[in-house]
């Protein structure tokens, strides 16, 4: 949940209590367990970023 007194995060981002700022939902592809990803429900689940095959 966003901290009291904080401006709402822009579209495509979500509040991170861990980092104390809005974070891009796009980064949940690489770091899906980040706290703010819970607020990115509109973003479809995605696997970890690919490495070399």
């Amino acid at each position: 949940e966003q901290a009291p007194g904080q401006a709402p995060c822009s579209r495509g981002s979500s509040w991170s209590a861990d980092l104390d700022k809005c974070m891009d939902c796009a980064s949940c592809r690489a770091r899906p367990h980040s706290d703010f990803c819970l607020g990115c429900a509109a973003a479809p689940p995605a696997p970890f970023r690919l490495l070399w095959p």
Partner: antibody, heavy 119, light 111 residues
């Protein structure tokens, strides 16, 4: 204010070794992956190595050109990241930057440290 | 590895006009939702600086004169109106997979 200070560069002979250091401040270091990126006139900007978090068992990833020769490490207690470079070649001559990334973006860059490999 | 090809290699634009820089990837760097492409600015004698992330989102503090667009393999950086301080080299970078790669850069000169 985010600050990144690279050091350790200089002149080294081919086949030699060098250890670069980067001290960071102004952001939660333990929550960010850290990268080394280098820049040369010949190859432009080139990602070299990345180290992830303690919770990732400090997983490391390397460019093909760095595999087997370079080792990235970090000391969270000192908010520092290092690049040990062995068996250096002329083509490793570049400015080396450290840069934190949460996931995809290299959010900040230091001033860089210059490495010259020449006999 | 994903190859990023920037064009043009250099361009000169009159003060107040539009600068357009292209970056083409050798394979798609987009999902149905997001594109994993960034743009950086490097002024002469300085370190690179993040301008645009995820193809179109301005980093904090970046003037609205800068905009990014594109998806899949084709991406564009626009600067309008250009100012003297925009003299720099601009690089695209993908974060689709490892290794991260950068474009060769586009040098922008203001006439």
């Amino acid at each position: 204010e985010v600050k990144l200070g690279e050091s350790g560069g200089g002149l080294v002979q081919p086949g030699g070794s060098m250890k670069l250091s980067c001290v960071a401040s102004g952001f939660p270091f333990t929550k960010y992956w850290m990268n080394w990126v280098r820049q040369s006139p010949e190859k432009g900007l080139e990602w070299v190595a990345e180290i992830r978090l303690k919770s990732d068992n400090y997983a490391t990833h390397y460019a093909e050109s760095a595999k087997g020769r370079f080792t990235i490490s970090r000391d969270d207690s000192r908010s520092s990241v290092y690049l040990q470079m062995n068996n250096l070649r002329a083509e490793d001559t570049a400015i080396y930057y450290c840069s934190p990334t949460y996931a995809d973006t290299m959010d900040y860059w230091g001033q860089g440290t210059s490495v010259t490999v020449s006999s | 590895d994903i190859v990023l090809t920037q064009s043009p290699a250099s361009l000169a634009v009159s003060l107040g006009q539009r600068a357009t820089i292209s970056c083409k990837a050798s394979q798609s760097v987009s999902t149905s939702t997001y594109s994993y492409m960034q743009w950086y600015q490097q002024r002469p004698g300085q370190s690179p600086k993040l301008l645009i992330k995820y193809a179109s989102k301005l980093d904090s503090g970046v003037p609205a004169r800068f905009s990014g667009s594109g998806s899949g393999t084709d991406f564009t950086l626009n600067i309008h109106p250009v100012e003297e301080e925009d003299t720099a080299t601009y690089y695209c970078q993908h974060s689709w997979e490892l290794p991260y790669t950068f474009g060769g850069g586009t040098r922008l000169e203001i006439k």
